[in-house]
């Protein structure tokens, strides 16, 4: 029951996380204009991974896509790649995890197969979450670097009458969405991996034979224990002696993965 709950919760948390990663990737507010130096601006700028936007006080918003590929900074391209990889891995992970859910019956799928699928999806979620966190962190680092560079530039060349206020950008809402979503996907992945351990079947898959000491000699018939491994014939083994040894098949006819000594 706990395993099913852990797996189900892991799936839901990952689903929310991946939805968040997709949302963050599509959002326009990765960086927003810093209003500290110019709080009275009537024009507000913000930028995303795919386009930059300008919102005027009047309500008019204009967005322009980055139609160039080669002209974009390498860091921006890297962030795009990380986010897309995160989304793709997450989507595949979700698909795999749906079939791995213990509460869903698909044909005669073994528990071992479900365990493997749960582990696979868990790893995918972890990598997906890490990709998103890495992407957002790289972008945040880029913003911080540019912020201080533009701050340094802002206070140079102010000797003249005319001032040119350089637009500085700070963290946008998408960064926080991305960090949270990446974290959730990561947590969901870890939960799936934990659930996988509970789903894994016992590896001790053997038949036990017990021996009882006897006072008189026993004649053993060659091949008498041929089917005692539990993987051969389903017919009951005949008792070929009066004392000494007997097969566990007399107690349990069919092979089982829960046979203990």
């Amino acid at each position: 029951m706990a395993v099913t709950a852990c797996q189900g919760l892991g799936f839901v948390v990952s689903l929310i996380g991946i939805a968040g990663i997709i949302a963050a990737t599509c959002m326009d507010q990765w960086s927003t204009q810093d209003l500290y130096n110019n709080p009275v601006t009537a024009v507000f700028n913000y930028q995303g991974l795919w386009r930059s936007c300008v919102r005027e006080s009047s309500g008019f918003t204009e967005c322009r896509g980055y139609f160039t590929l080669l002209g974009l900074p390498a860091m921006l391209q890297a962030v795009r790649a990380l986010m897309i990889v995160g989304i793709v891995l997450g989507a595949i992970g979700l698909l795999v995890s749906i079939f791995a859910l213990k509460c869903i019956r698909i044909g005669s799928m073994e528990d071992s197969a479900k365990a493997n699928m749960t582990l696979t999806s868990g790893i995918m979620f972890i990598v997906s979450g890490l990709c998103a966190i890495a992407g957002v962190s790289v972008f945040a680092n880029m913003l911080v670097t540019n912020f201080w560079m533009s701050t340094a530039n802002m206070y140079t060349g102010m000797g003249g009458m005319v001032q040119t206020v350089q637009t500085r950008y700070t963290f946008g809402a998408a960064l926080f969405v991305g960090w949270v979503a990446g974290g959730l996907t990561l947590i969901g992945g870890v939960m799936m991996c934990i659930a996988c351990r509970g789903l894994a079947p016992e590896e001790t898959n053997y038949k036990a034979v017990s021996y009882h000491a006897s006072g008189h000699s026993v004649a053993y018939k060659p091949g008498g224990f041929k089917a005692s491994t539990g993987f051969g014939s389903n017919t009951k083994n005949k008792k070929i002696y009066d004392g000494g040894a007997r097969t566990e098949d007399e107690v349990q006819s069919y092979p089982s993965k829960h046979d203990y000594v």
């Epitope: 009275v40 009537a42 024009v43 930059s52 006080s57 009047s58 637009t167």
Partner: antibody
């Protein structure tokens, strides 16, 4: 058809308050901003403040302590209140619709003349 | 506050001539995000309220004759009226609409 009409008291005593109402038609106050601009006799234009569609306001820094702008969307009315009037507040007061583009002001009322005198 | 300086304060021309008037701002009105200049031009004829001519420094308002042309970027802007007509007799104001307060220039009076 876009129309803006200002209605004011005409004559106000010094240190008193000025209240002007701007009644609009042909557009919604929830979508467009309304600016207030004044023009002293024979002088240039002075922007006083604006109330945007979402209700947010911005005022001229020199008047921020004396000026307040509000509106009633359902009645399509915008209100200007200027406190502690002095003689140099004598002017024609215009209410002006904000354009959707470029923060410009595209439709002007005819203006209401206000004289501050004892 | 951004200070808008217009020159000349008045100019006299004959009908059919081309006239240019200048507007300078104390800070750049160019927005880096969309490369647009947030400057507007208004025309105020005697006894009338002002009328919007140009926004974004160079975009003509609908219904404005194409003899009115706005140009310039950053801090220096120009309004050009080609083939001036008698009806163009007015005071022309430039206005900063980039940051609050939305300051006006002192105006250029066109006499014909």
């Amino acid at each position: 058809q876009v129309q803006l009409k200002e209605s004011g008291p005409g004559l106000v005593a010094p240190s008193q308050s000025l209240s002007i109402t701007c009644t609009v038609s042909g557009f919604s106050l929830t979508t467009y901003g309304i600016n207030w601009v004044r023009q002293p006799p024979g002088k240039g234009l002075e922007w006083l403040g604006v109330i945007w569609g979402d209700g947010s306001t911005n005022y001229h820094s020199a008047l921020i302590s004396r000026l307040s702008i509000s509106k009633d969307n359902s009645k399509s009315q915008v209100f200007l209140k200027l406190n502690s009037l002095q003689t140099d507040d004598t002017a024609t007061y215009y209410c002006v619709k904000s354009s959707y583009y470029g923060n410009a002001m595209d439709y002007w009322g005819q203006g209401t003349s206000v004289t501050v005198s004892s | 506050d951004i200070v808008m300086t217009q020159s000349p304060s008045s100019l006299t021309v004959t009908a059919g001539e081309t006239v240019t008037m200048s507007c300078k701002s104390s800070q750049s009105l160019l927005n880096s995000g969309n490369q647009k200049n947030y400057l507007t031009w208004y025309q105020q004829k005697p006894g009338q309220p002002p009328k919007l001519l140009i926004y974004w420094a160079s975009t003509r308002e609908s219904g404005v004759p194409d003899r009115f042309t706005g140009s310039g970027s950053g801090t220096d802007f120009t309004l050009t009226i080609s083939s001036v007509q008698a009806e163009d007799l007015a005071v022309y104001y430039c206005q900063n609409v980039y940051s609050y307060p939305f300051t006006f220039g002192s105006g250029t009076k066109l006499e014909i």
